[in-house]
């Protein structure tokens, strides 16, 4: 902490300007009024202060606002934001999307830092839900943001916000997250026609149940293997060879390339070899002709 010393004569800052970069740390502490700094925060960003000088400026703001900075100051923090700790940020009440954008801009191009994560958490909690504009902003800065949320947090996303989600935003989502997002997407896109609906819902299908996949198979959607491979295994298993053929359309040939990978492998094991042979792909591993299939899970449930 900087020791309290009197400001030398003639050095009292009348405004925040470039002359301050020549001030020693103790001079900044003694000669810059915290209230003046707070009202002229927007100028700080344009001045090439050293990290040590920024520490002093932060210290002055901390003294002025021990309960947390007001939004008028937060919005203009600029690079001073990088000096904030998650503990500092937890004291803030950020409600303006413009403030959020301004601070995310400072961290742009970098991984999500603990400070940014805390800021986003405070902002979203303050709003009560992840609305479309917020989601738009967050995924623009961090495409993986949505998949960093827990299923519980995702449950607060309203279906209307799903329109802001791009396919790449879901790349790292796991099945548990897609289980939450899929019903919301289904609701959001329910009024679209067949082909348009499929284009929009495609990225979310990792959360789709069997009955929805069966319904899609009746709509000539031609699902590609990249999408098929991301489906829930338990949703794929009950599909018949005919349903998978309809679901994939011309892409059905791709099953051969994935015959050892889930969910294709597990699905093949459930099909009659005769039925697989009708595809003409050379798929192996189906149930031989004449074998009886027992559903042991049902038997266990009964016993």
């Amino acid at each position: 902490e900087v020791e309290k010393t009197a400001c030398p004569s003639g050095k009292k800052a009348r405004e925040i300007d470039e002359s301050l970069i020549f001030y020693k740390k103790w001079e900044l502490e003694a000669c810059v009024d915290a209230a003046l700094l707070a009202t002229q925060m927007d100028r700080v960003n344009a001045i090439p202060f050293t990290y040590e000088q920024l520490d002093v400026l932060k210290h002055k703001l901390d003294e002025l606002y021990p309960q947390g900075y007001p939004e008028s100051v937060i919005q203009h923090l600029g690079y001073l934001f990088l000096k904030m700790s998650p503990e500092d940020i937890r004291k803030w009440n950020v409600t303006s999307l413009e403030t959020l954008k301004a601070l995310l801009e400072v961290n742009k191009g970098h991984e999500m830092s603990p400070q940014v994560a805390t800021l986003i958490d405070r902002f979203v909690k303050g709003r009560g839900q992840l609305d479309k504009d917020t989601l738009d902003t967050l995924t623009a800065f961090y495409p993986g943001y949505l998949c960093s949320l827990s299923p519980e947090e995702l449950s607060s996303v309203p279906p209307s916000s799903i329109w802001a989600v791009r396919p790449q935003d879901l790349d790292t989502c796991d099945p548990r997250q897609l289980d939450v997002l899929y019903p919301k997407a289904r609701l959001a896109f329910q009024n679209m026609n067949g082909s348009e609906y499929f284009v929009k819902i495609q990225s979310f299908l990792g959360g789709a149940p069997t009955e929805d996949l069966k319904a899609l198979s009746q709509q000539n959607v031609s699902m590609d293997l990249a999408t098929f491979m991301k489906l829930r295994t338990d949703a794929v298993l009950p599909l018949t060879v005919a349903e998978v053929q309809k679901l994939l359309g011309p892409h059905v040939e791709g099953l051969k390339a994935e015959e050892r990978h889930r969910p294709v492998r597990d699905w093949i094991l459930r099909q009659r070899q005769d039925d697989l042979d009708t595809l003409g792909l050379g798929l192996q591993g189906g149930i031989p002709n004449g074998y009886l299939v027992l559903d042991l899970s049902m038997q266990e449930a009964l016993s």
């Epitope: 396919p167 790449q168 790349d171 590609d224 293997l225 990249a226 098929f228 491979m229 991301k230 892409h251 040939e253 791709g254 099953l255 051969k256 390339a257 994935e258 050892r260 990978h261 889930r262 792909l281 050379g282 192996q284």
Partner: antibody, heavy 119, light 108 residues
Amino acid sequence: DVQLQQSGPELVEPGASVRIPCKAAGHTFTDYNVDWVKQSHGQSLEWIGDVNPNTDGAIYNQKFEGKATLTVDTSSSTAYMELRSLTSEDTAVYFCARRRLGQGGFDSWGQGTTLTVSS
Amino acid sequence: QVVLTQSPAIMSASPGEKVTLTCGASSSLISKYLYWYQQKPGSSPKLWIYSTSNLASGVPARFSGSGSGTSYSLTISSMEAEDAASYFCHQWSSYPYTFGGGTKVEIK
């Protein structure tokens, strides 16, 4: 521009292990399997196995079971191959290659990592 | 496993000459699962022909592929200097995927 970037040459002692990374850029990582291929002294190619980035499930050529372990880290779009209990027989160039889900053939290859096992 | 045997192992051809490389499989393949790769010294292999007869993007039209069952071939209708390379056939009809031993094509 699709790229698979592999690490530089490795010189390791017999009995040791090595982990070779393959970082992907320019495509949606989860839309492609990553396959690994061995080429000994400029001769033929041997398929080691492949890994699916969605399930992290790997399939191996039986010859390389217990020798190679294939994994992926989707957050960094990187596939890895670990080779263990190395002997001089493992001296080779190792390539990673991408294969679009549902398609055969490798449409893009890494530059190869030369592994030399020697004491 | 399916063994792929390529012949000849090495060959040289004059510019303008027709070149045919063969690839025999130890058991019958579905032809769409037979591919060819080109590799030049110090470089990675490149996908050259897929599904027996389809040229990969950027491959000159003087190349062609054909075959079925256990017998496949790659043909260069008129050899050029840039075609000097090794060519490997590859099958993914059954596990494990396998490659042929390669044919090295040199220019005279």
